[in-house]
Amino acid sequence: EPPTACREKQYLINSQCCSLCQPGQKLVSDCTEFTETECLPCGESEFLDTWNRETHCHQHKYCDPNLGLRVQQKGTSETDTICTCEEGWHCTSEACESCVLHRSCSPGFGVKQIATGVSDTICEPCPVGFFSNVSSAFEKCHPWTSCETKDLVVQQAGTNKTDVVCGPQDRLR
C-alpha cells in the first residue's frame, strides 16, 4: 500500500517517499522506483539552509556599502551572508537591510549602553548627583565634583547638565 506520510528528511510524491536534498543542494529530479532523489549543489553566491525540495537556491544577501552595510560573515552554500553596519552606524532592523547613524545622548543624558552594529545607543537621564554637558554617543553621566574632598564648598549647585562649582570656604574672622 502506498505511504500517506514519510519519515523526517523525506517527502511524498507519486505515492512514494523520496529523500529531501541536503542543505546546500537543490532538487533536480524526484526519486524513482530504482534511484534516489537527484540533487545538485547550489551555485556560487547561492544557498539553501534546510533539507529541501527547492528547485532554486536562494541568492546570498548583498551587503550594500551605499546603505552603510558590510559583510560580517560570508555566506556558504548552506548559510546566508550576514551583514552588519560600518563603524558608527547600526542596523535599522533585525534583517539588517540598511543602517543609520548611532544616536547621541543630549546634555542631561548619559550613555547607558553603547551602540553596536545591530543596536542603537541607549541613553538615560542623569540622576541627581550626576551630569552630562555634552552630546555624545559614548559619554556616561559623570558624578558631580565632591567639593568637600577638596576642602572646598559648593558655590553653585550642580544640575543634570552642569557640574557643581566649588569655591573656598569663608574664613572665620
Epitope: 507519486n14 532538487l27 529530479s29 524526484d30 534511484t35 537527484e38 545538485l40 528547485t55 532554486h56
Partner: antibody, heavy 116, light 111 residues
Framework: QVQLVQSGGGLVQPGGSLRLSCAAS????????MSWVRQAPGKGLEWVAN????????YYVDSVKGRFTISRDNAKNSLYLQLNSLRAEDTAEYYC?????????WGQGTLVTVSS | QSALTQPASVSGSPGQSITVSCTGT?????????VSWYQQHPGKAPKLIIY???SRPSGVSNRYSGSKSGNTASLTISGLQAEDEADYYC??????????FGGGTKVTVLG
C-alpha cells in the same frame, strides 16, 4: 508507470529544421529536470541539452549552441527540442530522458536524418 | 567539452571479473560524485546500472559495482555472464553545468 513517448523525427535537408517532442506520463513532470541525448549511427552517446523544472535554466553541448533550443510545457507534460540549421553530423537517434545528469528513464528514441 | 576516455573494448571469460575505466578531468569526474554508468544492448535504449559513482539502481545485479579515484571512475563486472556482452558508457556532471559521456566500451564475453 513512467513513460516517455517521442515523436517528430524524420529526413531533413541540411540547413533545415525539425521539432522533436517527448510526452511524459506516470510521474510529476513539473518537478523534474529533463534532458536530450543523441547517438549517431554506430557511435557513442552524446549529451545534447537539459532544462530545469520551470524552464529558467537550459544547458547545451557546445556543438548545438545557437542552433538547438530545448523547451517544455508543464501543462502538457511535454518536452521539446527545436533543431535548426541542421548539419549532416546531427544525424542521430535522439532520446529524451528524465533527469538532469542521470537517466533511469529514456524515451524509445527518434531518428533524425540530415541528408540532401 | 571533451568526451571522457574509455577503452574501446574489454573482454573476459565467463565467471571472470573485468574493470572498465573512465578518465576525465578535475572539472568533471574529479570534482563531482555524479558519475553514472549505462549498459546498452544493440538496438535498445541505454539502461542505468550505476549512479552517483557507486550506487546501484534497485533491480540491477550486484555483480556491477562502481568506484572513483581522482579523475578516473571504474565499473567492475564480476562473475561475467553472456548477457553482460554490451556497450558500456560512463557519464559525469561537469563544472559548466553540462553532462559529458565517455566514448563507450564494448564488453565481449569470450567462449
Amino acid at each position: 508507470q513512467v513513460q516517455l513517448v517521442q515523436s517528430g523525427g524524420g529526413l531533413v535537408q541540411p540547413g533545415g529544421s525539425l521539432r522533436l517532442s517527448c510526452a511524459a506520463s506516470g510521474f510529476t513532470f513539473s518537478s523534474n529536470w529533463m534532458s536530450w541525448v543523441r547517438q549517431a549511427p554506430g557511435k557513442g552517446l552524446e549529451w545534447v541539452a537539459n532544462i530545469n523544472q520551470d524552464g529558467s535554466e537550459k544547458y547545451y553541448v557546445d556543438s548545438v549552441k545557437g542552433r538547438f533550443t530545448i523547451s517544455r510545457d508543464n501543462a502538457k507534460n511535454s518536452l521539446y527540442l527545436q533543431l535548426n540549421s541542421l548539419r549532416a553530423e546531427d544525424t542521430a537517434e535522439y532520446y529524451c530522458a528524465r533527469g538532469g545528469y542521470r537517466y533511469a528513464y529514456w524515451g524509445q528514441g527518434t531518428l533524425v536524418t540530415v541528408s540532401s | 567539452q571533451s568526451a571522457l576516455t574509455q577503452p574501446a573494448s574489454v573482454s573476459g571469460s565467463p565467471g571472470q571479473s573485468i574493470t572498465v575505466s573512465c578518465t576525465g578531468t578535475r572539472s568533471d569526474i574529479g570534482d563531482y560524485n555524479y558519475v553514472s554508468w549505462y549498459q546498452q544492448h544493440p538496438g535498445k535504449a541505454p539502461k542505468l546500472i550505476i549512479y552517483d559513482v557507486s550506487s546501484r539502481p534497485s533491480g540491477v545485479s550486484n555483480r556491477y559495482s562502481g568506484s572513483k579515484s581522482g579523475n578516473t571512475a571504474s565499473l567492475t563486472i564480476s562473475g561475467l555472464q553472456a548477457e553482460d556482452e554490451a556497450d558500456y558508457y560512463c557519464s559525469s556532471y561537469t563544472s559548466s553545468s553540462t553532462l559529458v559521456f565517455g566514448g563507450g566500451t564494448k564488453v565481449t564475453v569470450l567462449g
